[in-house]
């Protein structure tokens, strides 16, 4: 059972049938902190089912303490929280890790991004790294359009000063892995991938570490590329509308395209008896299109004023770019004035102006 | 190699209007963005606004919002800055630059970054 | 808005001369700071984003630190082509802000 991807790896597991009391961990931690303990199985082989014990008592799991049969994390860690942890078979009680675990009053905030990326003694508690915002950290998956820059980042502390190393798809990641290169900070905890292409696609995990522990946290990057298509038009517009003579009507077409889309409104009309041409196409009359100072938006609107019966009819909202056309229609009906409004369908709607 | 040239520009009245272009080339113009700047004569930069012609997406400042529009023709590789109710203020050089996104989770907001300029079109509202 | 406020508004230098350039956020805006040079009649050119990175093709004696509030443009050695006026951006916010510019004149 995997705690997610944020794994503080501090645990190692007794290559010997119980470990000698030399040999348990001594774990220094932030208050706040996210404790987490790993007890991987001894030789790599199958573990068996296990339980985590603090201070001789079992753990029970909880929205703060989060237990799995490798892995312990208890989370915003205080005081309390310190004291002996141990990992156990649990048909044979044998205990498999042993942990010492200490939570100070470390700071786990505010980043010193400009400091020296050097590992020195700076003279507070000695302690394995931790994130100074943990909160800032929940996100795992970034996805960005292609050609734009990306950066990962992992502000971390401890003492000594931790390290950070970078990952992808689990392997040591240099600047001659991909075209263009990465651009490290250390003193930022950051990784920068500029102008990022689909092959950039994958896992990208930091290694924060130094002698007292190991933290690690994974991103996934998604890089889009967009596929051109042809206007969308949103479904239900424009609607039929139902107004009465004298009125103002109005038809409303809400269009979406990557390319700069053309807006025309047209009315069918009949020619010589005929709504259709000899080839089918219907016979319309341009009411609104493109103008030197028109915008999409006011394309996007079909206003009728005053309207007659010779108003009345089907109208269409048509948008093209340069992969294709799309096109909705619409009816409008026109009631004399004296007499009672009534809906002309349940998709209608009534404008008495 | 990556170009944007402006066009457009010129002498209008006060209260007129005016569309400026910015024909791009040498770059995915879907995949990144476009921000007019805008310069009055002796002054700093002011940014005027941007569009991501991926998905349509505008922001402008305050001092143009309702009066500018920004658009984009992805299959002309041009972004368009169309100027209404003009006022004396606005007199400057527009630039239009090619914008990127520095997309980062650990904090809440895109930076964005204005790498290529064009040369700018010179705007002159006056009676 | 958040106000960019870059120090000095002007300075004089000579070639060779190492020059530090300041701009002052009105509030946090992270690392999100990009730097821009100017010469007079030409559009803007980037320099630095990020507060620290150098965009491809810079000079390396441009260098950009600081985060949060206060930020510094350093020229470690000035050049001739250097002298012109440079403008800090911060974009954390909406709008996009700039500072008011300083101006690196010759001695």
């Known amino acids: 059972e995997s705690l997610g991807t944020e794994q503080r790896v501090v645990g190692r597991a007794a290559e010997v049938p119980g470990p000698e009391p030399g040999q348990q961990e001594q774990l220094v931690f932030g208050s706040g902190d996210a404790v987490e303990l790993s007890c991987p199985p001894p030789g790599g082989g199958p573990m068996g089912p296990t339980v985590w014990v603090k201070d001789g008592t079992g753990l029970v799991p909880s929205e703060r303490v989060l237990v799995g049969p490798q892995r312990l994390q208890v989370l915003n860690a205080s005081h309390e929280d310190s004291g002996a942890y141990s990992c156990r078979q649990r048909l044979t009680q044998r205990v498999l890790c042993h942990f010492s675990v200490r939570v100070t009053d470390a700071p786990s905030s505010g980043d010193d991004e400009d400091g020296e990326d050097e590992a020195e003694d700076t003279g507070v508690d000695t302690g394995a790294p931790y994130w100074t915002r943990p909160e800032r950290m929940d996100k795992k998956l970034l996805a960005v359009p292609a050609a734009n820059t990306v950066r990962f980042r992992c502000p971390a502390a401890g003492n000594p000063t931790p390290s950070i190393s970078w990952l992808k798809n689990g392997r040591e990641f240099r600047g001659e892995h991909r075209i263009g290169g990465i651009k490290l900070r250390h003193q930022q905890w950051s990784l920068v991938m500029e102008s990022v292409v689909p092959s950039d696609r994958g896992n990208y995990t930091c290694v924060v570490e130094n002698k007292f522990g190991s933290i690690r946290q994974t991103y996934t990057l998604d890089v889009l590329e967009r596929s051109p298509h042809r206007p969308i038009l949103q479904a239900g517009l424009p609607a039929n509308q139902t107004a009465v003579l004298g009125s103002d009507v109005e038809f409303h077409c809400k269009v979406y395209s990557d390319a700069q889309p053309h807006i025309q409104w047209l009315k069918h009309v009949e020619v010589n008896g005929s709504k259709v041409g000899p080839d089918g196409t219907p016979y319309v009359t341009v009411l609104k299109t493109a103008g030197a100072n028109t915008t999409d938006k006011e394309l996007e609107v079909l206003s009728l004023h005053n309207v007659t019966f010779e108003d009345a009819g089907e109208y269409t909202c048509l948008a093209g770019n340069s992969i294709g056309f799309s096109h909705h229609s619409a009816w409008l009906v026109v009631l004399p004035a004296e007499e009672e409004l009534v809906e002309a369908d349940e998709a209608g709607s009534v404008y008495a102006g | 190699e990556v170009q944007l040239v402006e066009s457009g520009g010129g002498l209008v009245q006060p209260g007129g209007s005016l569309r400026l272009s910015c024909a791009a080339s040498?770059?995915?113009?879907?995949?990144?963005?476009i921000s007019w700047v805008r310069q009055a004569p002796g002054k700093g930069l002011e940014w005027v606004g941007r569009?991501?012609?991926?998905?349509?997406?505008?922001n402008y400042a305050d001092s143009v919002k309702g009066r500018f529009t920004i658009s984009a023709d992805t299959s002309k590789n041009t972004a368009y800055l169309q100027m209404n109710s003009l006022r004396a203020e606005d007199t400057a050089v527009y630039y239009c630059?090619?914008?990127?996104?520095?997309?980062?989770?650990?904090?809440?907001?895109?930076?964005?970054?204005?790498?290529?300029w064009g040369q700018g079109t010179l705007v002159t509202v006056s009676s | 808005d958040i106000q960019m406020t870059q120090s000095p508004s002007s300075l004089s230098a000579s070639v060779g001369d190492r020059v530090t350039i300041t701009c002052r956020a009105s509030?946090?805006?992270?690392?999100?700071l990009a730097w821009y040079k100017q010469k007079p009649g030409k559009a803007p050119k980037l320099l630095i984003y990020?507060?620290?990175f150098l965009y491809s093709g810079v000079p390396s004696r441009f260098s950009g630190s600081g985060s949060g509030t206060d930020f510094t443009l350093t020229i470690s050695s000035l050049q001739p082509e250097d002298f012109a006026t440079y403008y800090c951006?911060?974009?954390?916010?909406?709008?996009?802000?700039f500072g008011q510019g300083t101006k690196v004149e010759i001695k």
């Open positions: 630059a090619r914008t990127y996104g520095i997309y980062d989770l650990y904090v809440d907001y895109t930076e964005y970054v204005m790498d290529y």
């Open positions: 040498g770059f995915t113009f879907t995949s990144t963005g």
């Open positions: 569009i991501y012609p991926t998905n349509g997406s505008t």
């Open positions: 509030q946090d805006v992270d690392t999100s």
């Open positions: 990020s507060a620290s």
């Open positions: 951006q911060q974009s954390t916010g909406h709008p996009q802000t």
